[in-house]
């Protein structure tokens, strides 16, 4: 960066080096230049000369005033003429920083995804700061009184094999600036209480053609949760409202949900479940797609391998991978 | 056993500095830990001044009044905690201790002898 | 700011009598709370931590009680060397950025 360069005299920046966005600033250049009294000090910023707002202090020092600085980042520096020298010569350059301190973190969020081995923790960090922000994700045992912290600049994954001091913590997340520091709520929690069961897939449908067509949904799930809470929502590809089904579920088999079904329409099925009684869900499954035969059943489209089975008597859909959801990171 | 011994507490004017020091042996400085400073001014009760929480990485806490002009800092090396004191006043003069449990919780099974801190013209 | 109250900030005992300290919080502590005796001269000694468990080496006639933001000290049966300032101390978090003290006034304990 600029700050590594040779000076041969100071640059500095009042009020700081990282100031809040929308200040009035001002950049003070002083030479120290052997055998030189500079005729004219020069500022740059991003290698472009700045032409207004610069006043000469004394024979040495001089002056750039910014008002309502909105740029995140920028390189200074600075520069003097002096006499007999063709060229200016460097005086010394400086990087500056204006952003915001951060926001309280809310929303506070930690589950554990079944066979993860770790407790994830997440929450709104508010507004963009522009600068570096770090946050410290304190996690501290209501039994105990042992306190853990885990310094991060996003999310935190916690290995569940470090949480020794029981079932019960307090975490709450503190955000740091140069401009300031918050700290979050507590949020209380039982690591028994924030288990996502292990994430439930559709593997393919199949439409029976009796005197009322029925659809048959395949979907499963590795969970080892005994009693898991499931909802099913599906919808024409043309419409926007969903309709859901909800379901007490036992995964020891292959969950097979019936759905009446108009003819000759594309629809598309997402699952998600919870343990029940439990506060988070998973997120929604990927997109899957089925198309339901018109009344003389027919081959579906191959985009999403349909194949047809007993002789004419069925449409089937196979997944085929992962479209994303619509909102995946609905775990509320 | 934990000990705790502070050092480094005298007579200082006003607008002088002062750092002290808290020698601990007994702790399992790998493990994560707080290690704060109490202090004690004559016939008045405990103030909290400052904690610091050492473990993957370090977290320093300090009481409101002692904000920028105080500093906690610890070397493992050498098992010391220190308090930086800039700017001091006469109304900092008090007992200033040092006090842990050892690990990462926040009440005190061991307290240091005190060593007392005088500002004054 | 999480403010602690103690009262009553004077106790006159009698030796063989029970006795009752309280401390409010502010603000929700859960169960981090700690008791403290500081005897005349000496350093603070912990009596009481996570508001009921008992400190090694304490006897048993100090019990703490309570949680949230309402907690009770009490001595089954004073004796002589019970006397001394008793401090009560939150001790769930000091990252909060606008703390003053975490410790209570004191109350002190002394013989009628």
């Known amino acids: 960066g600029i700050t590594n360069i040779n000076c041969s005299g100071h640059i500095w920046v009042e009020p700081a080096t990282i100031f809040k966005m929308g200040m009035n600033i001002s950049i003070y250049c002083q030479a120290a230049i052997k055998n030189c009294q500079p005729r004219k000090l020069h500022f740059y910023k991003n290698g472009i000369k700045e032409r207004f707002q610069i006043t000469r202090i004394n024979k040495t020092t001089a002056r750039l005033w910014y008002k309502n600085f909105l740029e995140p980042h920028a390189s200074m520096y600075c520069t003097a003429e002096c006499p007999k020298h063709f060229q200016e010569t460097l005086i010394c350059g400086k990087d500056i920083s204006s952003g915001y301190p951060p926001d309280i973190p809310d929303e506070v969020t930690c589950v554990i995804y079944e066979y993860s081995g770790n407790m994830t923790c997440t929450w709104n960090a508010g507004k963009l700061t522009y600068i570096d922000t770090k946050y410290v994700v304190h996690v501290k045992s209501l039994e105990t009184e042992e306190e853990q912290q885990y310094l991060t600049s996003s999310y935190i994954n916690i290995s569940t094999d470090s949480l020794q001091g029981g079932k019960k913590y307090l975490v709450w997340v503190q955000a740091a600036n140069a401009l300031g520091m918050e700290e979050s709520k507590q949020l209380q929690i039982h690591l028994d209480d924030i288990v996502i069961p292990s994430a439930a897939v559709i593997s393919r449908a199949e439409t029976i053609n009796a005197t009322v067509p029925k659809t048959i949904i395949y979907w499963d799930s590795q969970t080892t949760i005994e009693k898991v809470s499931c909802e099913m929502r599906y919808k024409a590809t043309t419409n926007q409202t969903w309709n859901v089904k909800e379901f007490d579920t036992n995964f020891t088999y292959v969950q097979q949900s019936e759905f009446y079904l108009e003819p000759n329409i594309k629809y598309v099925f997402q699952v998600r479940c919870q343990e029940t009684g439990k506060r988070y869900w998973q997120p929604w499954s990927s997109l899957f797609f089925h198309k339901t035969p018109e009344t003389v059943p027919q081959v579906t489209s191959k985009a999403f391998q349909h194949d047809t089975w007993n002789s004419g008597l069925t449409v089937a859909s196979i997944s085929t991978g992962h479209l994303t959801s619509d909102n995946r990171g609905d775990i509320g | 056993e934990v000990q705790l011994v502070e050092s480094g507490g005298g007579l200082v004017q006003p607008g002088g500095s002062l750092r002290l020091s808290c020698a601990a042996s007994?702790?399992?400085?790998?493990?994560?830990?707080?290690m704060c400073w109490v202090r004690q001014a004559p016939g008045k009760g405990l103030e909290w001044v400052s904690c610091?929480?050492?473990?993957?990485?370090?977290?320093?806490y300090y009481a409101n009044w002692a904000k920028g002009r105080f500093t906690i800092s610890r070397d493992n090396s050498k098992n010391t905690l220190y308090l930086q004191m800039n700017s001091l006043r006469a109304e900092d003069t008090a007992v200033y201790y040092c006090?842990?449990?050892?690990?990462?919780?926040?009440?005190?099974?061991?307290w240091g002898q005190g060593t007392l801190v005088t500002v004054s013209s | 700011d999480i403010v602690m109250t103690q009262s009553p900030l004077s106790l006159p005992v009698t030796p063989g009598e029970p006795a009752s300290i309280s401390c409010q919080a502010s603000?929700?502590?859960?169960?981090?709370l700690a008791w403290y005796l500081q005897k005349p001269g000496q350093s603070p000694q912990l009596l009481i931590y996570?508001?009921?468990k008992l400190a090694a080496g304490v006897p048993d006639r100090f019990s703490g009680s309570g949680s949230g933001t309402d907690f009770t000290l009490k001595i089954s049966r004073v004796e002589a060397e019970d006397v001394g300032v008793y401090y009560c101390?939150?001790?769930?978090?000091?990252?909060?950025?606008?703390?003053?003290?975490?410790f209570g006034q004191g109350t002190k304990v002394e013989i009628k």
């Open positions: 006090a842990t449990s050892g690990s990462s919780v926040l009440y005190f099974k061991f």
């Open positions: 007994g702790i399992d400085f790998n493990s994560n830990y707080y």
């Open positions: 610091i929480y050492v473990g993957s990485h370090v977290n320093t």
């Open positions: 603000e929700n502590i859960y169960s981090f």
């Open positions: 996570s508001a009921s």
């Open positions: 101390q939150q001790t769930n978090r000091y990252s909060n950025p606008d703390i003053y003290n975490v």
